[in-house]
Amino acid sequence: HAPEDPSDLLQHVKFQSSNFENILTWDSGPEGTPDTVYSIEYKTYGERDWVAKKGCQRITRKSCNLTVETGNLTELYYARVTAVSAGGRSATKMTDRFSSLQHTTLKPPDVTCISKVRSIQMIVHPTPTPIRAGDGHRLTLEDIFHDLFYHLELQVNRTYQMHLGGKQREYEFFGLTPDTEFLGTIMICVPTWAKESAPYMCRVKTLPDRTWT
């Protein structure tokens, strides 16, 4: 028989999405046991039928990768988890409506920081996603978000920072003191979707000025 409250077996069914990798996660409830098994279904918003996710049927782990199944950027999705205990009790819980564009969070960018004598160059590498274009290429975040830009900061000392920003991939902070350590932080910003990545940080030291030796 079904428990009085599904939360006894199953809790916190939700999508966790980062850079468009969409993972369904959940927790067992207070009456869940290690031998409770979970089966996952998903559907596109507006569709009637649920589709069983292959590889996520009667599993004991508490996550299921639905990246491929929820990979259309223009669609909205639901997923649901059915938990069945060793004693035959079952409970089903559904996610809130999921939009990868809206809900995905952004990881820090991949950046190369290059020291020079009086400047520090920062090269941002475009971030790939699991989403494939019609030609088979993986889309980058830049392909998906028109408004994506990079915000770069260089901590010169405790009271002074230099800022750069834009949609370019190459930046350079000029007018720095040779043989000095600086802390750089680089973030991805997407204002339209109110997204901001955690910062990539690089601690770099300008090169010594050999011209005076």
Epitope: L73, I131, A133, G134, D135, H137, L139, D143, I144, H146, D147, F149, H151, H163, L164, G165, G166, K167, Q168, R169, E170, C189, P191, T192
Partner: antibody
């Protein structure tokens, strides 16, 4: 050398349709953001639409939504703007432009669209 | 949509004058602002991007400053070839929007 060449403009009656083309060369067309920008006679500049040629993601300015459709033929390095239900206020020079290395720095020479009865 | 308010709408300058054009955004756009120059019958030409960075090949008499909501384009000594219309553009969020333009004429 980056080149953008627009074509397809002309005189059309209100309610009519027109399809603009922009032939692109000198850069990687299949992974770029491409724009249509217009300029009404004696007026300022207005971004009309944008498309990412790899993802197919599109955006439109509110005044043309439901009437204009931006698209590409990546095999032919060509950008299109299908304009339906044209109004007199759509009369303008239409430029295509592209973003290269983060900057909207390359523009075509423009094609004139006149909507008049 | 973000509104860009540019002023003045026109100005008369003598050759060698210092000219300042301002642009105000209706909300913060960080440093996502560009300045373009347009001459009659031509497409716009990029002068400044990132609010203050000079595009390659643009004379150093052009400079830009500002961040957030308030921006300025300065021509330190106007030359005959600078007589044109100047537009600011916010490149922060779609729809990208231009200012109304400033026509720089000869006094």
């Amino acid at each position: 050398e980056v080149q953008l060449v627009e074509s397809g403009g002309g005189l059309v009656q209100p309610g009519g349709s027109l399809r603009l083309s922009c032939a692109a060369s000198g850069f990687t067309f299949s992974s770029s953001w491409m724009y249509w920008v217009r300029q009404a006679p004696g007026k300022g500049l207005e971004f009309v639409s944008v498309i990412n040629t790899r993802s197919g993601i599109t955006h439109y300015v509110e005044s043309v939504k439901g009437r204009f459709t931006i698209s590409t033929d990546n095999a032919k390095n060509t950008l299109f703007l299908q304009m339906n239900s044209l109004k007199s206020e759509d009369t303008a020079v239409y430029y295509c432009a592209t973003r290269i290395q983060g900057l909207i720095d390359y523009w075509g020479q423009g094609t004139q669209v006149t909507v008049s009865s | 949509d973000i509104q860009m308010t540019q002023s003045p709408s026109s100005l008369s300058a003598s050759l060698g004058d210092r000219v300042t054009i301002t642009c105000q955004a209706s909300q913060s756009i960080s440093s996502q602002l560009a300045w373009y120059q347009q001459k009659p019958g031509q497409a716009p030409k990029l002068l400044i991007y990132g609010a203050s960075r000079l595009q390659t090949g643009v004379p150093s008499r052009f400079s830009g400053s500002g961040s957030g909501t308030s921006f300025t384009l300065t021509i330190s000594g106007v030359e005959a070839e600078d007589l044109a219309t100047y537009y600011c553009l916010q490149d922060y969020s779609w729809p990208l929007t231009f200012g109304q333009g400033t026509k720089v004429e000869l006094k």
